[in-house]
């Protein structure tokens, strides 16, 4: 017989399966051009020696044999006596150490009988229904296929699971969707219906991440307030990276998660935009207000759980920056501009109450005036810091206000509403004798010391209702008692107390009278 | 709902032909391979064969060879098995079953009895 | 072709937990699907692929698998739990599907 042809005469060699475990198995015979077949086969146990033999029956019942030696893969022609129209049934005998081992057979029309491709195109990924789909296009003249797709995670070995019959020009396969861990895919694929048809090779990996994206685990931390009113935010740890199964390790597109970073500025509500989003790794320069930060974490399946902190205000005051003048037609107020065309935010509320309830007034975009200096004026119409308390007020700015990272914090200081001068005229004025020639003046303290930096000073003042001399002695915000001294027995005084602002006089409490009583020796 | 709805219970004589059918509803009949399972009184389950139904391709277990076929007609949706050369060994609850991604039966028709007695 | 070996019977107490093992060559490439089948109904799916339930399946029934074996384990069994048990797998070598010989399970 010629070595390209089957062979129909009896192999040389006895006809006795052994029924030995190992031998040869998997026999895989297809089509592989117009006119030529391949058939391969694989062989369990040790090779040396092992001389392989392809048999093939025909339909009339005829048989024939192609002598393989030791290779497990043999080609030939339509030409070779072998009917590839049609159907036909094919096994390997292998001869090893004296006995014969036999693969199960095939059955199969071996003209038809095409080898399969494994998706190769883009394969689309989506979820439905808490499972994975997979969607690609079928290769070009392989409608109808079986299709099996394998699948791992990190820690566990591969397995097998099935798509389905596929029948179509797009081919689609259900899998299963890990929650919290990233998976690869291979997708394989063989003719659908023919026995002994040999599976294609294995896709190339499709990494998929988990339903759930991790968790970010990142800590911020926040500078000191700037000279140009900009702390920066800063990242102390990294987000934890996703394990990867090992055909996704490198370059792996489908499980990448990504971190934004979302600002929610809670100070100065009646700004135009509260809340913005970035990227991580882009990490702002933030004003001194109070903000909500959050980190989402997302994958290609949407957005996972975030983490969220709260950066409180920077409480840092000013004491002098800010200038209040109160006129009879209203307030103003007069700080240093910063730039040309600011746009600035005034806020307020009261001091010792909930931040919920601060009060804000934008301003159009200003440039300085002559003097270097920014203003907000209101009228008392407005009742805007009209009651007579503490505020704290604090003023932003921004040259783009609709970006919620351009803004700074200008200042921050506190300012007694109303009319401030007379709410702040401390009460409760006594004299008390100290010495023969000195008494001791106390008070209750001014509501403006409730306002930190507003009470510039107290100022006792004391007539002495013979002479009308009258002398004044500045005493320290933080004091409430004062000694006057040189005063002469038998005379009558009158004390009076008032507390001063920077930009303000207070009202003189009601005139208190009193008088050093003469001593009288024995 | 997802559903496989079987025929009425059969008594055969020995060397007779049953055919069991198996209606689907409630899915893509052509998308999911349909298998029958029997089971013989007091005894395990048996995997018999499986169909594909987009198109009509068969496997069957090497036991049933040459005596089990089984068709689809895509138009009712429905899947049928016949068993020829019957004996009183192949009396038993036949079972068509639905296969997921896991080659396991999610969906089971609810059995048709088949009694093979002379 | 593969085969699937279960033991034929296991006891367990009621509330008590309760494993029952499913052995062949062919767990070590495909996931095992587990079935109840409770006397003149037909099979129940109970657990398939890694461990999955399908709805209406109580949480008390889980699944694992490791190398050439495929486990059930009923965490708390219940006297409703009381049944025959079967595996299943695809056969490693060919296209066909196989089950193991089931398992009765009492509840004492």
């Known amino acids: 017989c010629r070595t390209s042809e089957c062979c129909f005469q009896d192999p040389p060699y006895p006809d006795a399966d052994s029924g030995s475990a190992s031998g040869p198995r998997d026999l895989r015979c297809y089509r592989i051009s117009s006119d030529r077949y391949e058939c391969s086969w694989q062989y369990e146990g040790p090779t040396a020696g092992v001389s392989h033999f392809l048999r093939c029956c025909l339909s009339s019942g005829r048989c024939c044999y192609f002598a393989a030696g030791s290779a497990t893969r043999l080609q030939f022609s339509d030409q070779a006596g072998v009917s590839v129209l049609y159907t036909v049934t094919l096994w390997v005998e292998s001869w090893a150490r004296n006995q014969t081992e036999k693969s199960p057979e095939v059955t199969l029309q071996l003209y038809n009988s095409v080898k399969y491709e494994p998706p190769l195109g883009d394969i689309k990924v989506s979820k439905l229904a808490g499972q994975l789909r997979m969607e690609w296009e079928t290769p070009d003249n392989q409608v109808g296929a079986e299709v099996q797709f394998r699948h791992r995670t990190p820690s566990s070995p591969w397995k097998l699971g099935d798509c389905g019959p596929q029948d179509d020009d797009t081919e689609s396969c259900l899998c299963p969707l890990e929650m919290n861990v990233a998976q690869e895919f291979q997708l394989r694929r063989r003719q659908l219906g023919s026995q002994g048809s040999s599976w294609s090779k294995w896709s190339s990996p499709v990494c998929v991440p988990p339903e759930n994206p991790p968790q970010p685990q990142v800590r911020f931390s926040v500078e000191q307030l700037g000279q140009d009113g900009r702390r920066r935010l800063t990242l102390k740890e990294q987000p934890t990276q996703l394990e990867l199964p090992e055909g996704c390790q490198g370059l792996a597109p489908g499980t990448e998660v990504t971190y934004r970073l979302q600002l929610h500025m809670l100070s100065c509500p009646c700004k135009a935009k509260a809340t913005r989003t970035l990227h991580l790794g882009k990490m702002p320069y933030l004003s001194g207000a109070a903000y909500n930060v959050a980190v989402i974490s997302s994958n290609q399946f949407g957005p996972g759980l975030n983490q969220t902190w709260h950066i409180p205000a920077d409480t840092h005051t000013e004491p002098v920056a800010l200038n209040i003048s109160v006129g009879t037609n209203g307030t103003t107020m007069y700080w240093p501009a910063r730039a040309q065309s600011m746009t600035y935010c005034i806020e307020w509320q009261p001091v010792g109450q909930d931040g919920g309830l601060a009060t804000c007034s934008l301003t159009a975009p200003q440039d300085p005036d002559p003097a270097g200096m920014a203003t907000y004026s209101w009228s008392r119409e407005s009742g805007a810091m009209g009651q007579e308390k503490c505020y704290y007020i604090t003023i932003f700015a921004s040259a783009h206000p609709e970006k919620l990272t351009l803004w700074s914090t200008v200042l921050s200081t506190y300012h007694f509403g109303g009319n401030a001068s007379a709410a702040g005229t401390p009460h409760h004025v006594s004299v008390k004798n100290h010495s023969l020639d000195s008494v001791s003046v106390d008070w209750a303290p001014s509501l403006l010391s409730t306002c930190p930096g507003v009470l510039k000073e107290y100022v006792v003042r004391c007539r002495d209702e013979d002479s009308k001399q009258v002398s004044e002695h500045p005493v320290q915000p933080t004091e409430t008692q004062v000694t006057l001294s040189g005063l002469r027995a038998g005379v009558a005084y009158t004390v009076q107390v008032r507390a001063d602002t920077a930009w303000l006089r207070g009202v003189w409490s009601q005139p208190q009278r009193f008088s050093i009583e003469v001593q009288v020796s024995d | 709902q997802v559903q496989l709805v079987q025929s009425g219970a059969e008594v055969k004589k020995p060397g007779a032909s049953v055919r069991v059918s198996c209606k689907a509803s409630g899915y893509t009949f052509t998308s999911y391979y349909i298998h029958w399972v029997r089971q013989a009184p007091g005894q395990g389950l048996e995997w018999m064969g499986i169909i594909n139904p987009s198109g009509g391709s068969t496997s069957y277990a090497q036991k049933f060879q040459g005596r089990v076929t089984m068709t689809r007609d895509t138009s009712t949706t429905t899947v049928y098995m016949e068993l020829s050369s019957l004996r009183s060994e192949d009396t038993a609850v036949y079972y068509c079953a639905k296969s997921n991604w896991a080659y396991a039966f999610d969906i089971w028709g609810q059995g048709t009895m088949v009694t093979v007695s002379s | 072709s593969s085969e699937l070996t279960q033991d034929p019977a296991v006891s367990v107490a009621l509330g008590q937990t309760v494993r029952i093992t499913c052995q062949g060559d062919?767990?070590?490439?495909?996931?095992a699907g587990w079935y109840q089948q409770k006397p003149g109904q037909a099979p129940v799916l109970v657990i398939y692929?890694?461990?999955n339930r399908p709805s209406g399946i109580p949480d008390r029934f889980s699944g694992s698998s490791s190398e050439d074996t495929a486990s059930l384990t009923i965490t708390g069994a219940q006297a409703e739990d009381e049944a025959d048990y079967y595996c299943?797998?695809?056969?490693?070598?060919?296209?066909?599907?196989?089950f193991g010989g089931g398992t009765k399970l009492t509840v004492l």
């Open positions: 299943n797998s695809r056969d490693s070598s060919d296209n066909h599907l196989v």
């Open positions: 692929g890694k461990n």
């Open positions: 062919s767990l070590s490439s495909y996931y």
